[in-house]
């Protein structure tokens, strides 16, 4: 991959700190069903244990079917730092639901990613800004905490802070979506 290292405050493409992103519509513009895996091809799986869901990052045996996640995509206005109308294009936000009525949510206090049962309208903690990167990998940035991404830590999903001045290509926040 190429290297372009202009380190403006958010030249990295992260959401500007302190920005307020408003979802432009209450219904998603599209949805897709996909399995989620890490950059190193480990699968993200979900298991019901003691009436709550646990999230695992693991190598799957070849014959085991990958868990699917419903990704719902929403448009969000991008607050402008330069253009006069106060809005500067759109971002894509996503919610992730591996099973009915359960959504991935950011727990910023615990730096963790959890599955919670909730009703619509979903809380802000369930929304993540979708970043396409490294040509065919994605990253998920917390709507509630810009610069913090879903990542892999000790075979679990966790929230990982990415410094604005760093290259966002770090493998532990890269995921692959597979619709097949």
């Amino acid at each position: 991959m190429g290297s372009s290292h202009h380190h403006h405050h958010h030249s990295s493409g992260l959401v500007p700190r302190g920005s307020h992103m408003s979802i432009t519509g209450i219904s998603p513009i599209t949805e897709s069903l996909a399995s989620l895996s890490t950059y190193n091809d480990q699968s993200i799986t979900f298991a019901l244990e003691d009436e709550s869901y646990e999230i695992y990052v693991e190598d799957l045996k070849k014959d085991k079917k990958k868990d699917k996640v419903l990704l719902s995509y929403y448009e969000s206005q991008h607050p402008s730092s330069e253009s006069g109308d106060g809005v500067d294009g759109k971002m894509l936000m996503v919610t992730l639901s591996p099973t009915k009525d359960f959504w991935l949510q950011a727990n910023n206090k615990e730096h963790s990613v959890e599955l919670h049962k909730c009703e619509k309208p979903l809380p802000d903690q369930a929304f993540f800004v979708l970043h396409n990167r490294s040509f065919n990998c994605v990253s998920f940035e917390c709507k509630t905490d810009p610069g913090v991404f879903i990542g892999v830590k000790d075979n679990h999903l966790a929230l990982i802070k990415v410094d604005y001045s760093e290259n966002l290509g770090s493998e532990n926040i890269l995921f692959k979506l597979s619709e097949t």
Epitope: M1, G2, S3, S4, H5, H6, H8, H10, S11, S12, G13, L14, V15, I29, T30, E31, S32, A34, Y73, H78, S80, S81, E82, S83, D88, G89, K90, M91, L92, V129, L130, H131, N132, R133, S134, F135, N136, E141, N167, L168, G169, E179, T180
Partner: antibody
Framework: EVQLVESGGGLVQPGGSLRLSCAAS????????MSWVRQAPGKGLELVSD????????YYADSVKGRLTISRDNSKNTLYLQMNSLRAEDTAVYYC???????????????WGQGTLVTVSS | DIQMTQSPSSVSASVGDRVTITCRAS??????LAWYQQKPGKAPKLLIY???SLQSGVPSRFSGSGSGTDFTLTITNLQPEDFATYYC?????????FGGGTKVEIK
């Protein structure tokens, strides 16, 4: 109002070089991925190169790898395409295009420049 | 790479007609498909993204549908300014690829 204005095209001999520029205005340039798309005379559209904002990831079509280099100067709101070892088959109108979504390519390209013609001929 | 095949390559129609253009992908994906309109000597213009979302400022006579491998652009009540070439583009995965184009001509 979003504007993209390309320049730098012209007639060049095979093996020669050109540098295309795309001056952007009306949006926060540094926040958006930018691309170069070309169209040979009477033909369809082909994505030539793409430069993501995040970490500067670049894409090149196989047909131009090693000969074309995409870059951007966020302080000047300008996208560039350095074209070396040009061939007759590179003859086309070259458009710069802005990604619809600031962090994703899923929405395609929402704004295009007027294009600049590159003619490679002896 | 995902190949995009458009049909027909050209269509003759009259003002007021309904025109349907189809785009078929060599492999399935959800709905990250865009449609563009291009007039001679001009840059392409985004009409539809995410298969069915109408770009701001585009007349509602344009609509898109489909997912998987088959996508459709429909123009109802064709207007004189709609005579142009239309391209589909898959925006699902790199390399982003375009269909070969469909020219809508005056009958």
């Amino acid at each position: 109002e979003v504007q993209l204005v390309e320049s730098g095209g012209g007639l060049v001999q095979p093996g020669g070089s050109l540098r295309l520029s795309c001056a952007a205005s009306g949006f926060t340039f540094r926040s958006f991925a930018m691309s170069w798309v070309r169209q040979a005379p009477g033909k369809g559209l082909e994505l030539v190169s793409d430069l993501r904002t995040s970490g500067g990831s670049t894409y090149y079509a196989d047909s131009v790898k090693g000969r074309l280099t995409i870059s951007r100067d966020n302080s000047k709101n300008t996208l560039y395409l350095q074209m070396n070892s040009l061939r007759a088959e590179d003859t086309a109108v070259y458009y710069c295009a802005k990604s619809h979504y600031s962090t994703s390519w899923f929405g395609g390209f929402d704004y295009w420049g007027q294009g600049t013609l590159v003619t490679v001929s002896s | 790479d995902i190949q995009m095949t458009q049909s027909p390559s050209s269509v003759s129609a009259s003002v007021g007609d309904r025109v349907t253009i189809t785009c078929r992908a060599s492999q399935g994906f959800s709905s990250w498909l865009a449609w563009y309109q291009q007039k001679p000597g001009k840059a392409p213009k985004l009409l539809i993204y995410a298969a069915s979302s109408l770009q701001s400022g585009v007349p509602s006579r344009f609509s898109g549908s489909g997912s998987g491998t088959d996508f459709t652009l429909t123009i109802t009540n064709l207007q004189p300014e709609d005579f142009a070439t239309y391209y589909c583009q898959q925006a699902n995965s790199f390399p982003l690829t375009f269909g070969g184009g469909t020219k809508v001509e005056i009958k």
